[in-house]
């Protein structure tokens, strides 16, 4: 912490500008008014302050707002956001999507930090649910965001928000998460026709039950092996050889390469050898 010293004559900052770049830490502490800093936070981002100087500016804001910063200041934190701790952020009440976007922009290109995770958590809790605009924003910055949520947290996602989800956003989701998301996706896309529906639902199928897979097998969807391998084992096991053949279409030949891997391995063991032989792939049950 910077020692408290009087501001030298002529060095009191009338505004936040580039003349402060070469101030020493103690001079920033003594000569920059915290209230002025709060009203001109938007300028800080354009000035090449060192991380040491940013520490001093943060300290001034902390003293001015011990209960947490107002959103008018938070929105313009810029690089100073990187100095915040999760404890600092827990004091905030962030309600504007624009504020969220501004802070995520600062962290762009980096992995999700504890600060960002706390910020998102505060924001979503404040909104009560993960609406489409929020999800759009979060997945744009962090494609893996959705899969970082617990099944309980995912349950607050309204079906309408599912339209914002891209296939890559689900890459790291586990079956428990897809179990929650799939019914929402099914509801969201229910009014689409067969082929369009399959394109949209495909990424969510890791949460689909047997009856839905059976229904899909009647629609000539030609599911690729990558999607098939992500299906729930318990949902695949009851499928007949004929149903799997219809589900995969021309991709059925890929079963041979995957015969030692779940769910294909377990499914093969459940089938009669005569039925498997009809595929002509040499699969051994």
């Amino acid at each position: 912490e910077v020692e408290k010293t009087a501001c030298p004559s002529g060095k009191k900052a009338p505004e936040i500008d580039e003349s402060l770049i070469f101030y020493k830490k103690w001079e920033l502490e003594a000569c920059v008014d915290a209230a002025l800093l709060a009203t001109q936070m938007d300028r800080v981002n354009a000035i090449p302050f060192t991380y040491e100087q940013l520490d001093v500016l943060k300290h001034k804001l902390d003293e001015l707002y011990p209960q947490g910063y107002p959103e008018s200041v938070i929105q313009h934190l810029g690089y100073l956001f990187l100095k915040m701790s999760p404890e600092d952020i827990r004091k905030w009440n962030v309600t504007s999507l624009e504020t969220l976007k501004a802070l995520l922009e600062v962290n762009k290109g980096h992995e999700m930090s504890p600060q960002v995770a706390t910020l998102i958590d505060r924001f979503v809790k404040g909104r009560g649910q993960l609406d489409k605009d929020t999800l759009d924003t979060l997945t744009a910055f962090y494609p893996g965001y959705l899969c970082s949520l617990s099944p309980e947290e995912l349950s607050s996602v309204p079906p309408s928000s599912i339209w914002a989800v891209r296939p890559q956003d689900l890459d790291t989701c586990d079956p428990r998460q897809l179990d929650v998301l799939y019914p929402k996706a099914r509801l969201a896309f229910q009014n689409m026709n067969g082929s369009e529906y399959f394109v949209k639902i495909q990424s969510f199928l890791g949460g689909a039950p047997t009856e839905d897979l059976k229904a899909l097998s009647q629609q000539n969807v030609s599911m690729d092996l990558a999607t098939f391998m992500k299906l729930r084992t318990d949902a695949v096991l009851p499928l007949t050889v004929a149903e799997v053949q219809k589900l995969l279409g021309p991709h059925v030949e890929g079963l041979k390469a995957e015969e030692r891997h779940r769910p294909v391995r377990d499914w093969i063991l459940r089938q009669r050898q005569d039925d498997l032989d009809t595929l002509g792939l040499g699969l051994q049950g």
């Epitope: 030298p8 060095k11 003349s19 070469f22 020493k24 090449p48 302050f49 060192t50 040491e52 690089y79």
Partner: antibody, heavy 119, light 106 residues
Framework: EFQLQQSGPELVKPGASVKISCKAS????????MNWVKQTNGKSLEWIGI????????SYNQKFKGKATLTVDQSSSTAYMQLNSLTSEDSAVYYC????????????WGQGTTLTVSS | QIVLTQSPAIMSASPGEKVTMTCSAS?????MYWYQQKPGSSPRLLIY???NLASGVPVRFSGSGSGTSYSLTISRMEAEDAATYYC?????????FGSGTELEIK
């Protein structure tokens, strides 16, 4: 050991542009601001501007606004200065210089890049 | 911007002699910085924050002053001290340098 290695001498025609590099080694590049300084005829030194390698934010001496553009490449720990619309007035030695902790002077300097603008 | 005037412009000293050069600022500054430059070389930081010796600088160098008047002193001149010395301020934006004092060996 700390080192700022600048690119070699440049001979360019009036009206052209040039980009001078300054590669930092031996310290954490993003922890210290980088300055650029002009020296004409081995005499006076003029401060051109400063850049924060961590955030890419910069500030310029009014005299060099529009003439110089400062950038950094964090991946190679290199600072750059581009000078455009060159005239004979721009012929000089240009230095990059690191600012020490808590603004304690330009503690490390590059070896200088000689720019000659001539037709 | 603040103008720094160095005097004398040129001076010479014998080995072992005490040398003092001054730097006068057109307005008050908080700190002064001093650099040494030898022909064909980059400037080298000697003194920071008015009176602190930079790393590796011999203790025969010292700096002092306040307000608008600052000085650099070499307690005992040595041949290797022959160089041009520049003062610099950044209390007021933009940073500025003095025009230099050229120190020769007698």
């Amino acid at each position: 050991e700390f080192q700022l290695q600048q690119s070699g001498p440049e001979l360019v025609k009036p009206g052209a542009s040039v980009k001078i590099s300054c590669k930092a080694s031996g310290y954490s590049f993003t922890d210290y601001n980088m300055n650029w300084v002009k020296q004409t005829n081995g005499k006076s030194l003029e401060w051109i501007g400063i850049i924060n390698p961590n955030y890419g934010t910069s500030s310029y001496n009014q005299k060099f606004k529009g003439k110089a553009t400062l950038t950094v490449d964090q991946s190679s720990s290199t600072a750059y200065m581009q000078l455009n619309s060159l005239t004979s007035e721009d012929s000089a030695v240009y230095y990059c210089a690191r600012v020490g902790r808590d603004n304690s002077g330009f503690d490390y300097w590059g070896q200088g890049t000689t720019l000659t603008v001539s037709s | 911007q603040i103008v720094l005037t160095q005097s004398p412009a040129i001076m010479s000293a014998s080995p072992g002699e005490k040398v003092t050069m001054t730097c006068s600022a057109s307005s008050s500054v908080s700190y002064m910085y001093w650099y040494q430059q030898k022909p064909g070389s980059s400037p080298r930081l000697l003194i920071y924050d008015t009176s602190n010796l930079a790393s590796g600088v011999p203790v025969r160098f010292s700096g002092s002053g306040s307000g608008t008047s600052y000085s650099l002193t070499i307690s005992r001149m040595e041949a290797e001290d022959a160089a041009t010395y520049y003062c610099q301020q950044w209390s007021s934006y933009p940073p500025t340098f003095g025009s230099g004092t050229e120190l020769e060996i007698k």
